[in-house]
């Protein structure tokens, strides 16, 4: 038979099995605290980095572009795409029409400053939308042009030139003298491209990728 | 051998028109740029007019706009020059020039001898 | 308007010295490497003759004396050695852009 315990030695036991209980209790707590904090400041440091990293991409952008307009893109609040104001945007671009009469070199020079280039068209959608902006009364610069004179049209970004993706007028290009070209709009075929002197001053279309943040 | 001959110059009084002609031959006149370049007596040269080869462009300095219009008839390989209100400021040899395309622009290859233009009352 | 101002306004050189007439511009008259500057000559009583396009391309028939340099803004004409019929006045034209203007000439006379 076991021999009854001492009132002692019980309370002694008693007072060990509590200690035990409220020590898991503690760790318990802590790592509990521990696990919520953890969760707090996770998300909080990673949002406060990604916040300095847009930050210094938006100080990037803020010598030419101080107001810049973005849009959520996608279900992700964390992405956003953003096109300088008061550029237009259209898919993964901006646009923004420059009503400044230059020469076509001088034109290139103004979009390059802005970190963009006169406009290279890829698409019909994308003339489509780049007309809606336009005045009917005015001739404006394309991001294309023949220095040499041979007819070996060039984008300004190296896109390849593909004659099947070209909108030119009836009867241009036309003239081996004109090696620019530009968009402007004939009553007979809406708009279109045509091919110009290039030290002859237009307005022009820059271009440049979505900015995002 | 390239030649141009201007004609036409002469004195007039202000407010007056003359209209120069410039006679271009050997080379394929239809397919060259071509301007009007002017230099007022003991001055240097000033650009008047241009017309495209195709004659689908025009372009003049605001000095000379509204007033002075410039012409080519491909076919009788000649250049004009239409002088209309003239000032004591537009004396001066006007020159016939070719131009010849280079990249982005241009240069005057060849330079006819001029005609002189007086304007006085 | 780009503005042309060329120095100096005269320069007296021996036969077989060196002349040297800069053009500066007021703005770049540079693209992508090409250079729409381009120098005349002109004696008196004759009208100017092209020595020099896109700042340094001698004219078919113009003496290897002359030769062109310069980019941007900053352009030289040189002629060595100077002989007793340089003398002339010499222009500088740039054409990136309309209006296409002149430089006010240098005038080089021979010692």
């Known amino acids: 038979m076991v021999p009854e315990e001492e009132p002692q030695d019980r309370e002694k036991g008693l007072w060990w099995f509590q200690l035990k209980v409220w020590s898991m209790a503690v760790v318990s707590i802590l790592l509990l605290s521990v696990c919520f904090t953890v969760s707090s400041v996770v998300p909080h440091n990673f949002m406060y980095s990604k916040t300095v990293k847009r930050l210094s991409k938006l100080r990037e952008y803020q010598q030419y572009h101080p107001s810049l307009t973005c849009v959520m893109e996608g279900k992700d609040i964390e992405d956003w795409s953003c096109c300088p104001t008061p550029w237009t945007s259209f898919q993964s671009s901006c646009y923004f029409i420059s009503t400044g009469m230059q020469s076509w070199t001088k034109s290139q020079k103004n979009c390059s400053v802005m970190g963009a280039d006169l406009v290279v068209i890829n698409t019909r959608e994308e003339q489509d939308f780049i007309i809606q902006n336009l005045k009917r009364n005015s001739s404006y610069f394309l991001g294309l042009s023949d220095p040499g004179g041979r007819r070996h049209w060039q984008w300004v970004d190296q896109t390849p030139y593909n004659e099947n993706v070209t909108f030119w007028h009836s009867g241009e290009p036309n003239n081996l003298d004109e090696r620019c070209a530009i968009i402007n709009f004939r009553s007979s075929e809406e708009w279109g491209w045509n091919d110009i002197h290039c030290h002859v001053p237009q307005k022009s279309i820059c271009k440049m990728k979505k900015i995002y943040i | 051998e390239v030649q141009l001959v201007e004609s036409g110059g002469g004195l007039v009084k202000p407010g007056g028109s003359l209209r120069l002609s410039c006679a271009a031959s050997?080379?394929?006149?239809?397919?060259?740029?071509m301007s009007w370049v002017r230099q007022a007596p003991g001055k240097g040269l000033e650009w008047v007019a241009t017309?495209?080869?195709?004659?689908?462009?025009?372009y003049y300095p605001d000095s000379v706009k509204g007033r002075f219009t410039i012409s080519r008839d491909n076919a009788k390989n000649s250049l004009y020059l239409q002088m209309n209100s003239l000032r004591a400021e537009d004396t001066a040899v006007y020159y016939c020039?070719?131009?010849?395309?280079?990249?982005?622009?241009?240069?005057?290859?060849?330079w006819g001898q001029g005609t002189t233009v007086t304007v006085s009352s | 308007d780009i503005v042309l101002t060329q120095s100096p306004a005269s320069l007296a050189v021996s036969p077989g010295q060196r002349a040297t007439i800069t053009c500066r511009a007021s703005?770049?008259?540079?693209?992508?490497?090409?250079?729409?500057m381009h120098w005349y000559q002109q004696k008196p009583g004759q009208p100017p003759k092209l020595l020099i396009y896109?700042?340094?391309n001698l004219e078919s028939g113009v003496p290897a004396r002359f030769s062109g340099s310069g980019s941007e803004t900053d352009f030289t004409l040189t002629i060595n050695p100077v002989e007793a019929n340089d003398a002339a006045n010499y222009y500088c034209?740039?054409?990136?852009?309309?209006?296409?203007?002149f430089g006010g000439g240098t005038k080089v006379e021979i010692k």
């Open positions: 020039a070719r131009q010849l395309y280079y990249s982005y622009g241009y240069y005057f290859d060849y």
């Open positions: 050997g080379f394929t006149f239809s397919s060259y740029g």
């Open positions: 017309i495209s080869s195709g004659d689908s462009y025009t």
């Open positions: 703005e770049s008259v540079s693209f992508h490497g090409t250079h729409l």
């Open positions: 896109a700042a340094s």
């Open positions: 034209q740039q054409s990136i852009e309309d209006p296409p203007t």
